[in-house]
């Protein structure tokens, strides 16, 4: 806490300008009017204040706005934003995407700090949903942003926003998140033709059910192995050898390299060995000929 001292004669700041870099901490505290600072915050970024001086300016704003800064001030915080605590930010009401962009720019190229996470949370809650422009902005700064949200939070993403999502934005999503995002993507891309649709939907297929995979197998999509390996195991298991062959097209040969990994391993265990043999890949572990394959769900129903 900077103790209150009178401003020396002739040093009262008439405007926020570079002359203030020559002021000591106590002089800034005594000679800079908080209301003047608030109206001229846009100048602060262009003045080479030391961080120690910025601490004083923050203190002055905190005193002026104990309930939280107005957006006109927030938009011009610049480096001062990094001096804010999550508690400070929770008091803010940020509604402008331009303000959000300005603050994200300060932290650009670095992992999401607690301040940024709090800011984004406040912004999204204020908007009520993750609209396309917001999602565009957030994923541009933080490609992993989408996958940091809970399935509950993702449920507020409107299908129209899915157009802003790039494949790399989904790299760290788990199956629960893709379960929520896939139906939205399916809806968003529903009017596209086959090959274009597949290109767009591909990154979301980790949330696709069996029936959608069966439908894709009829469309000559040539799914790559990397995408296949990310599919839900429970969605892959009911697929027939013929369906998998059609789904993967020329990439079917890649199954051999993945035969010990899920979901390929579990799928192999469900197939007849003679069906697997038709692939000519030497896949082993299928059900030997002559054995009865009982659908487990049927078995439970019979017992």
């Amino acid at each position: 806490e900077v103790e209150k001292t009178a401003c020396p004669s002739g040093k009262k700041a008439r405007e926020i300008d570079e002359s203030l870099i020559f002021y000591k901490k106590w002089e800034l505290e005594a000679c800079v009017d908080a209301a003047l600072l608030a109206t001229q915050m846009d100048r602060v970024n262009a003045i080479p204040f030391t961080y120690e001086q910025l601490d004083v300016l923050k203190h002055k704003l905190d005193e002026l706005y104990p309930q939280g800064y107005p957006e006109s001030v927030i938009q011009h915080l610049g480096y001062l934003f990094l001096k804010m605590s999550p508690e400070d930010i929770r008091k803010w009401n940020v509604t402008s995407l331009e303000t959000l962009k300005a603050l994200l720019e300060v932290n650009k190229g670095h992992e999401m700090s607690p301040q940024v996470a709090t800011l984004i949370d406040r912004f999204v809650k204020g908007r009520g949903q993750l609209d396309k422009d917001t999602l565009d902005t957030l994923t541009a700064f933080y490609p992993g942003y989408l996958c940091s949200l809970s399935p509950e939070e993702l449920s507020s993403v409107p299908p129209s926003s899915i157009w802003a999502v790039r494949p790399q934005d989904l790299d760290t999503c788990d199956p629960r998140q893709l379960d929520v995002l896939y139906p939205k993507a399916r809806l968003a891309f529903q009017n596209m033709n086959g090959s274009e649709y597949f290109v767009k939907i591909q990154s979301f297929l980790g949330g696709a059910p069996t029936e959608d995979l069966k439908a894709l197998s009829q469309q000559n999509v040539s799914m790559d192995l990397a995408t296949f390996m990310k599919l839900r195991t429970d969605a892959v298991l009911p697929l027939t050898v013929a369906e998998v062959q059609k789904l993967l097209g020329p990439h079917v040969e890649g199954l051999k390299a993945e035969e010990r990994h899920r979901p390929v391993r579990d799928w192999i265990l469900r197939q007849r060995q003679d069906d697997l043999d038709t692939l000519g890949l030497g896949l082993q572990g299928g059900i030997p000929n002559g054995y009865l394959v009982l659908d487990l769900s049927m078995q439970e129903a019979l017992s």
Partner: antibody, heavy 123, light 115 residues
């Protein structure tokens, strides 16, 4: 005439700590009107300001966001020098490192520079 | 988009003038910023030349000839370093810098060749 003389190793192993020192002659590290900066230069990143130390009734350090979590700058008043420590280095930290004085009267323009130390991060 | 953009190279003849520009990213108005200029020759550290905020607020480095001067081009949102009466010893890399949000930010540099 103010001079800055740098010292420190030219080769650092990945994940280790890079330590460099900048000895000041003709000015004081405790000056109330100067800041003491570290800057690095590499072909991929160009000139990059890393941080500074300065005395204004007590010592302060400011760091660039890019290195804040793994960098420290320490003044040594008895030897009139300041040092840089950069932890957990990677090949990306390979660069020429410079120390420089920022003068308040030049609005912290950096008017005096050390000779530079070429640091290679490699195993 | 970087905060400061400089054209990578420029060639000029001895005795002529060279104008080196330093463009600020859109959204950052050059108006209130002080632009600092440095010269660097191969194997040497950068050398402070001058800083420029306005015609009435500029500072030449100690011993820097008056052939080196600063200005701003508001329409291009840029700082400008003007070198008049070019000499062979002016052949070097030139860097602009600003203090932005209390951190020093450098441009990518312009390599000036004196033909």
């Amino acid at each position: 005439q103010v001079q800055l003389q740098q010292s420190g190793p030219g080769l650092v192993t990945p994940s280790q700590t890079l330590s460099l020192t900048c000895a000041i002659s003709g000015d004081s590290v405790s000056s109330n009107s100067a800041t003491w900066n570290w800057i690095r230069q590499s072909p991929s990143r160009g000139l990059e300001w890393l941080g500074r130390t300065y005395y204004r009734s007590k010592w302060y350090n400011d760091y660039a966001v890019s290195v804040k979590s793994r960098m420290s700058i320490n003044p040594d008043t008895s030897k009139n020098q300041f040092s840089l420590q950069l932890n957990s280095v990677t090949p990306e930290d390979t660069a020429v490192y410079y120390c420089a004085r920022g003068m308040m009267t030049y609005y912290y323009g950096m008017d005096v520079w050390g000779q530079g130390t070429t640091v290679t991060v490699s195993s | 988009q970087p905060v400061l953009t400089q054209s990578s190279s420029l060639s000029a003849s001895p005795g002529a003038s060279a104008s080196l520009t330093c463009t600020l990213r859109s959204g950052i108005n050059v108006g209130p910023y002080r632009i600092y200029w440095y010269q660097q020759k191969p194997g040497s550290p950068p050398q402070y030349l001058l800083n420029y905020k306005s015609d009435s607020d500029k500072q030449q480095g100690s011993g820097v000839p008056s052939r080196f001067s600063g200005s701003k081009d508001a329409s291009a949102n840029a700082g400008v370093l003007l070198i008049s009466g070019l000499r062979s010893e002016d052949e070097a890399d030139y860097y602009c810098m600003i203090w932005h949000s209390s951190a020093a930010v450098f441009g990518g540099g312009t390599q000036l060749t004196v033909l």
